[in-house]
Interface confidence: medium
């Protein structure tokens, strides 16, 4: 899986669903977050 | 306002060291992961090395072509990001960067410092 | 290491039309795809990530698409700003990499 900056700060976001790529209508961000590329 | 400003660049002879310096402010730097990313003269972007936050026990990681050589290192009471450059070679030679992605209110938050340039030549 | 392969390195187009940039990856990447603008003398600007999200305040005529291996930036109508070079790059597995770049010059 993947452990990186971004897949967790999208991951905090709620950007991703559990499957992972698929962007959702609507997520609840949070301030929890982590850096890269 | 986030704002990341890179210092301690300079002429230096291979063989040599240098630290350099990244001064945040606008965000609560101890909560982020923070990147180097570098840019030789006339050439495309390459990451450098990551250091995660506090809570995750400032863990790094490193490009295979600067492992062993330069160390990345924080200090959150001082909102300061570091890379220290030993053994430098002339291919070091380049423009460091840096960056920091999060996420914070509503969206995707990134921001770059404006570079500092590293010359390694004799 | 994933490698990043852009295309065309230099692509030659006029204000008003449009720019498709290619990004594909040596490996699956699934959608941790951004792309940078970077002009001469300037830090990168991120304008899109999660290879379609568009970033805070970049115009709408820019566009992401993608997913896996393959990638797209499109610029619907270019405008004269629009003229930079602009790289790809993943984060999906460290080391982060980025693509070679490809300049976007005027006509």
């Known amino acids: 899986s993947c452990n990186t900056a971004t897949c967790v700060t999208h991951r905090l976001a709620g950007l991703l669903s559990r499957s992972g790529g698929v962007v959702k209508d609507n997520f609840v961000p949070t301030n929890v977050g982590s850096e890269a590329f | 306002e986030v704002q990341l400003v890179e210092s301690g660049g300079g002429l230096v002879q291979p063989g040599g060291s240098l630290r350099l310096s990244c001064a945040a402010s606008?965000?609560?730097?101890?909560?982020?992961?923070i990147s180097w990313v570098r840019q030789a003269p006339g050439k495309g972007l390459e990451w450098v090395a990551e250091?995660?936050?506090?809570?995750?026990?400032?863990?790094?990681h490193y490009a295979e072509a600067v492992k062993g050589r330069f160390t990345i290192s924080r200090d959150n009471a001082k909102n300061s990001l570091y890379l220290q450059m030993n053994s430098l070679r002339a291919e070091d030679t380049a423009v460091y960067y840096c960056?920091?992605?999060?996420?914070?209110?509503?969206?995707?938050?990134?921001?770059w410092g404006q570079g500092t340039l590293v010359t390694v030549s004799s | 290491e994933i490698v990043l392969t852009q295309s065309p390195a230099t692509l030659s187009l006029s204000p008003g039309e449009r720019a498709t940039l290619s990004c594909k990856a040596s490996k699956r990447v699934t959608t941790y795809v951004s792309w940078y603008q970077q002009k001469p003398g300037q830090a990168p600007r991120l304008l899109i990530y999660?290879?379609?999200n568009r970033y805070l305040g970049i115009p709408a005529r820019f566009s992401g698409s993608g997913s896996g291996t393959d990638f797209t930036l499109t610029i619907s109508s270019l405008e004269p700003e629009d003229f930079a070079v602009y790289y790809c790059s993943q984060s999906y597995n460290y080391p982060y990499t980025f693509g070679q770049g490809t300049k976007l010059e005027i006509k």
């Open positions: 999660g290879a379609s």
């Open positions: 960056a920091v992605y999060f996420d914070y209110g509503l969206a995707i938050q990134n921001y």
């Open positions: 606008g965000f609560t730097f101890s909560n982020y992961w």
């Open positions: 250091i995660r936050s506090e809570s995750d026990a400032s863990a790094t």
